[in-house]
Amino acid sequence: MAVTACQGLGFVVSLIGIAGIIAATCMDQWSTQDLYNNPVTAVFNYQGLWRSCVRESSGFTECRGYFTLLGLPAMLQAVRALMIVGIVLGAIGLLVSIFALKCIRIGSMEDSAKANMTLTSGIMFIVSGLCAIAGVSVFANMLVTNFWMSTANMYTGMGGMVQTVQTRYTFGAALFVGWVAGGLTLIGGVMMCIACRGLAPEETNYKAVSYHASGHSVAYKPGGFKASTGFGSNTKNKKIYDGGARTEDEVQSYPSKHDYV
């Protein structure tokens, strides 16, 4: 039960995180005009990864897309790339994790396959979350650098006669959405990896199980048999540990090849 809950929760958390990463990537408010200690303007400027916007005091808002690829700063391109990679990996991870969910039955998919898929999706979510966090952090660093540069020469002019007030930009809402979303995706990924451990079929030595063959009592000690080799009344292929049948969610965790992720 705990494994299913962990996997399900990991999926939901990752789903919310990836939705947040998509939202942050699409949002226009990555950087917003700094209103503190600045001349009061009748316009409010804000910028996203894809376009810049100006809201006038009347409420009229005008946005212009960045209709160039080569003319954009390399850092902005890098942030775009990181966010898109994060979304793509997250989307693939979601797709994989849907099929890996324990509560969903697809044909006769084995637990080992589900465990592998859970681990794969978990890793994808972790990388997706890291991409988003990295992208947002790179943009934030760029803003901080530009902020102090524009503060240093806030008023530039010729002979002090004609002044040009430089618009300073500070953190926009999208940065916080991105950080939180990246973190959620990361947490979701970790949860999926943890769930994978519980899903993994155990490779262990079982206690002796007696099989009665043609009147002779011969005890076989199968070393490392898979759990699906039961006979007689155990027709539902339940795992046999300690001579008793347990449901898949009650299986004890033993070290397996998926333990050290």
Epitope: P39, T41, A42, N45, S52, S57, S58, G59, Q163
Partner: antibody
Framework: EVQLMESGGGLVKPGGSLKLSCAAS????????IHWVRQAPEMGLEWIAY????????YYADTVKGRFTMSRDNAKNTLFLQMTSLRSEDTAMYYC?????????????WGQGTSVTVSS | DIVMTQSPSSLSVSAGEKVTMSCKSS????????????LAWYQQKPGQPPKLLIY???TRASGVPDRFTGSGSGTDFTLTISSVQAEDLAIYHC?????????FGAGTKLELK
């Protein structure tokens, strides 16, 4: 037709108070920010205050800050300018003007004005 | 506050003449966010309220004849009347629409010669 009509002007003694009104018609009043602009006799135009459409933002010129209060009643399509501690330099024609929606913050329609005289 | 300086203070012209008046601001009225200039021109005839002529430095307001042209960017702006008509005799004000307080120039009075 867009119309703005100021009222409430008159003669007042220095230190006195006066409340100007601006009645709007011909447009959705609650969709626009409104300005008050004054013009002293034979002088240029002086912007004195602005109120956003929802009253969330109000700006004042330094010359009137603390003495004048701008407000609006969107239900009655009316704008107000409460003037206190009036001085002789407040003598002017007071206009209310609509902040245009897509006119780069310019004032696209003006009222005919109401005259305020501050004199002892 | 932004200081708006208009020149000349008055102009005497004959009907049909081309007229140019200037407006300079103490700070740039070009908004970096959208690369638009926030300057307006108003026409005020005697005994009347001002009327919006040009906004955004160069866009004519609705109903304004095309003989009125606004130009300039940053701190230097110009209003040109290609062929002055009798009804154009008025005071022309320029206004900063980017920074509060929104400031006006002292005006340029257009008179008939």
């Amino acid at each position: 037709e867009v119309q703005l009509m100021e009222s409430g002007g008159g003669l007042v003694k220095p230190g006195g108070s006066l409340k100007l009104s601006c009645a709007a018609s011909g447009f959705t009043f609650s969709d626009y920010g409104i300005h008050w602009v004054r013009q002293a006799p034979e002088m240029g135009l002086e912007w004195i205050a602005y109120i956003s459409r929802g009253s969330s933002t109000i700006y004042y010129a330094d010359t009137v800050k603390g003495r004048f209060t701008m407000s609006r009643d969107n239900a009655k399509n009316t704008l107000f300018l409460q003037m206190t501690s009036l001085r002789s330099e407040d003598t002017a024609m007071y206009y209310c003007a609509r902040g245009g929606y897509d006119t780069r913050n310019a004032m696209d329609y003006w009222g005919q004005g109401t005259s305020v005289t501050v004199s002892s | 506050d932004i200081v708006m300086t208009q020149s000349p203070s008055s102009l005497s012209v004959s009907a049909g003449e081309k007229v140019t008046m200037s407006c300079k601001s103490s700070q740039s009225l070009l908004n970096s966010g959208n690369q638009k200039n926030y300057l307006a021109w108003y026409q005020q005839k005697p005994g009347q309220p001002p009327k919006l002529l040009i906004y955004g430095a160069s866009t004519r307001a609705s109903g304004v004849p095309d003989r009125f042209t606004g130009s300039g960017s940053g701190t230097d702006f110009t209003l040109t009347i290609s062929s002055v008509q009798a009804e154009d005799l008025a005071i022309y004000h320029c206004q900063n629409d980017l920074y509060y307080p929104l400031t006006f120039g002292a005006g340029t009075k257009l008179e008939l010669k």
